[in-house]
Interface confidence: low
């Protein structure tokens, strides 16, 4: 899969929606210049392609939604990489430009005669892509042509800025919300000194920025902050891990505003460096409850606490997806490649026959084996439905009493569609209300997950809490079998009575040494000792001073008893 030839999935229709999914992994560092993508992806790729195709079938067969109008699509591969996604978006735009020129009769043949050739229908909107950095680049292009974009997992806070990203909307909340949720978890367990890691790129950078800002306001100190690319080499991850160990045993908690593959890189480095069990990873929704992050490295991931966007599995998608077979599924051009990759076998007689697999695929193979639904499936489907409802509302207002596309909707005006989309609200696939605020964002609801060893060599994610619009609920007993097991991540222990904190030059406010006040001093505040005035003495609890009662000697009082040093 290189830059020369890109595969596209098509589905015909009266209105065409574009989609960008990461069908393949991003190019490795050495392949970036060629834009040569990595291996095929199931959850983030193939499942999302199939979700788009099948959801459109459901919409088209629903008599109440866009009656007499068929929705089609054009799905392209973003490879979770800006350059590839931009290249693909230009293809969307090119189709739109040619189509609009046709509408205006501007397309003529070389000999001057008019053309009877009809090019592809324009793309009215785009679903995706998944990554925030990639979504920003794509939006920069799409908004020039008034093409609305609805994202299903791009959560960067920057995308809320409508002056910069006018045509961008999303069915997920902004990362400001999960940064808050992460800080609330850190606060809950009294972790005041944590290390921080984020994925280079917009998602990680803006998310970590928010986490650090909120942490500072809550008196939480960051031991050190590091950044790394998901596709960085082993040496880079090893180097990062070694830096993190330099903050042990104080900063045991590592807050990771990271893409899933960054977390995997960290886990792999922990294995190489034998650091399993030394850290507790607190991960953002890039990790969530993904098995492709932890597979093979479960021991290193144990104890991890992660944030997951609330999105239950979609049963009807599984009913459809699990029946798919390579010999009958021809509309998904990546399916045969995926099948071979998934089962590590060769599909004989298919053009994408891959010689790297020696074994021929058995006809009894089924997707039911080890099936895991994409954790963001509900959002992908909601994004597609949002586009359909937006178009439906637009049709109702522009073509009253008319079933189908009236002239007022030809061609579809992106500005009017955006207006209609922003007003859209409907019941989502999981029964929750889908609506958009003035920034095109959706409300924040998260599940808190914990990766645990459930039995010998059996590991899994369990739901241990939720964060809903500012309220954190956690089942502490599920995370920690007993209170004494709660990991400590503090730089300095509290000072004892009569001691003050002395913060060393250049140290953060969470790291101090405890120094006792002098004999005639009391603790004025946690950083200052003050001498009692003449004639007074510190109280027993050293919080203030008491006057020393004056005693006058009278005749007849016994003499004071002076002892020699030699007296025992």
């Amino acid at each position: 899969q290189s830059s020369e030839r890109r595969v596209v999935a098509h589905m015909p229709g009266d209105i065409i929606i574009g989609a960008l999914f990461s069908v393949h992994h991003q190019p490795t560092v050495d392949k970036v210049h060629e834009r040569k993508c990595g291996a095929v992806r199931e959850q983030y790729g193939i499942q999302r392609v199939e979700a788009m195709l099948h959801t459109l079938e459901r919409i088209n067969s629903d008599p109440t939604l866009l009656p007499n109008i068929t929705l089609g699509c054009e799905i392209r591969d973003s490879c979770w990489h800006s350059a590839v996604a931009l290249e693909q978006s230009i293809e969307f735009i090119r189709d739109s430009l040619i189509s609009s020129e046709e509408e205006e009769g501007l397309v003529r043949c070389v000999d001057g005669s008019s053309s009877s050739f009809r090019s592809k229908k324009p793309i009215v909107g785009v679903i995706g892509p998944g990554s925030s950095s990639v979504a920003i680049q794509v939006q920069n292009l799409l908004q020039l042509f008034n093409i609305p974009q609805i994202a299903y997992s791009a959560t960067s806070m920057d995308l809320s800025d409508k002056t910069l990203f006018k045509y961008f909307m999303r069915v997920v909340p902004s990362d400001a919300q999960q940064a808050r949720a992460m800080v609330d978890i850190v606060k809950r367990y009294n972790w005041t000194y944590v290390s921080a890691v984020h994925t280079e790129g917009n998602y990680g950078e803006s998310g970590m920025e928010a986490f650090k800002d909120m942490s500072a306001k809550e008196g939480i100190c960051i031991a050190h902050s590091y950044k790394i690319y998901s596709n960085a080499g082993e040496q880079s991850f090893d180097k990062l891990l070694k830096k993190l160990t330099s903050h042990l045993p104080k900063a045991r908690v590592v807050a990771c505003f990271c893409e899933g593959m960054t977390v995997r890189g960290l886990l792999m480095a922990m294995r190489r460096l034998g650091l399993a069990g030394e850290f507790l990873l607190l991960g953002s929704d890039g990790w969530a409850d993904r098995y492709d992050v932890t597979d093979g490295y479960q021991r290193e991931a144990v104890g991890g606490i992660t944030i997951k966007l609330q999105s239950p599995d979609v049963k009807w998608f599984d009913d459809y997806y699990l029946k798919l077979r390579p010999e009958t599924n021809h509309r998904n051009p990546w399916f045969q490649e995926f099948w071979q990759h998934r089962f590590q076998c060769r599909l004989e007689g298919f053009p994408q026959e891959n010689s790297k697999y020696n074994k021929t695929c058995d006809s009894s193979l089924t997707l039911k084996t080890h099936h895991v639904q994409d954790s963001k499936m509900g959002f992908v489907i909601n994004a597609i439905y949002s586009m359909a409802y937006g178009l439906h509302n637009m049709q109702m207002s522009l073509c009253p009493g008319y079933a189908g596309l009236c002239d007022a909707m030809k061609p579809i005006d992106g500005r009017k569609l955006l207006e209609s989309l922003m007003k859209t609200n409907f019941t989502g696939v999981s029964g929750d209300m889908i609506l958009f605020d003035e920034n095109g964002d959706s409300p924040g609801r998260y599940e808190i997950m914990n990766f645990k060893e459930m039995g010998k060599d059996y590991f899994d994610y369990i739901n241990v809490g939720s964060w809903d619009n500012g309220e954190l609920k956690m089942d502490d007993d599920e995370v920690w079998s007993k209170k004494s097991n709660i990991i400590r991540s503090v730089c300095s222990e509290p000072c004892e009575k009569g001691q003050i904190k002395v913060i060393r030059k250049g140290e953060v406010s969470c790291c101090w040494t405890c120094t006792p006040c002098k004999e005639n001093e009391y603790v004025f505040d946690e950083y200052t000792c003050k001498a009692c005035q003449l004639g007074s003495w510190p109280t027993d609890d050293l919080t203030g001073c008491d006057l020393i009662p004056v005693q006058y000697l009278r005749w007849g009082d016994p003499e004071p008893d002076y002892k020699d040093d030699d007296d025992k």
Partner: antibody
């Protein structure tokens, strides 16, 4: 039953070269392990030499072994240890061992060892 | 490289008794320590990994503890079959290298 079997040991002259092979049976390296070599001089303690990660072929060496010893995964069931510039101090029983980490989880499967004698 | 110092070199105890073997690392190795039992003519057998985790099939009479630089292996209710040489193995993550202790010979009377 999972087993490791070392071969290739024997008598070699000082300055010579020898390649030891560790063959796994009942184990498929696609499960990703660390395959390591440990040696034990007669009547002495254990000495770690090197490990190879079967997932990507990454190698890890004791500082004294770098340059003279080369560990590699040669197939889905074999690992080799190539030893050059051998001296009498290299006389030992060489064990092949398997672990889940380079060292952090210990080695839970060992071969019976192969004896290497360096002598003129 | 990391250096592992094991004490004592030899220890004698009666059946039913308890033996304690200590292992000290020259640098902090966190919990990265394993204990092995080796009998003459046999390869080592893993007893404990990550300082305190009992390998499956190993009796609970074997107990590992410690972290950082100081580690201990305690064998209680000694049996004749426990007579062997015991080795600690430390793993230093910063240099990705291992080192074994010199070994402790346990004699059971």
């Amino acid at each position: 039953q999972q087993q490791l079997e070392e071969s290739g040991g024997g008598l070699v002259k000082p300055g010579g070269t020898l390649t030891l092979t560790c063959k796994a049976s009942g184990i498929d390296f696609s499960g990703y392990y660390y395959m390591c070599w440990v040696r034990q001089a007669p009547g002495k303690g254990l000495e770690w030499i090197a490990c190879v990660y079967t997932g990507d072929g990454g190698t890890y060496y004791a500082s004294w072994a770098k340059g003279r010893f080369t560990i590699s995964k040669t197939s889905s069931t074999t690992v080799t240890l190539q030893m050059t510039s051998l001296t009498a101090a290299d006389t030992a029983t060489y064990f092949c061992a398997r672990g889940s980490g380079v060292g952090s989880y210990g080695y839970n499967l060992w071969g019976q060892g192969t004896l290497v004698t360096v002598s003129s | 490289d990391i250096v592992m110092t094991q004490t004592p070199a030899s220890v004698e105890a009666a059946v039913g008794g308890t033996v304690t073997i200590k292992c000290q690392a020259s640098e902090s190795i966190y919990s990265n320590l394993a204990w092995y039992q080796q009998k003459p003519g046999q390869p080592p057998k893993l007893l404990i990994y990550r300082a305190s985790n009992l390998e499956s099939g190993v009796p609970s009479r074997f107990k590992g503890s410690g972290s950082g630089t100081e580690f201990t292996l305690t064998i209680s209710d000694l049996e004749c079959a426990d007579a062997a040489t015991y080795y600690c193995q430390g793993y230093y993550a910063i240099t990705t290298t291992n080192a074994f202790g010199g070994g402790t010979e346990v004699v059971v009377k």
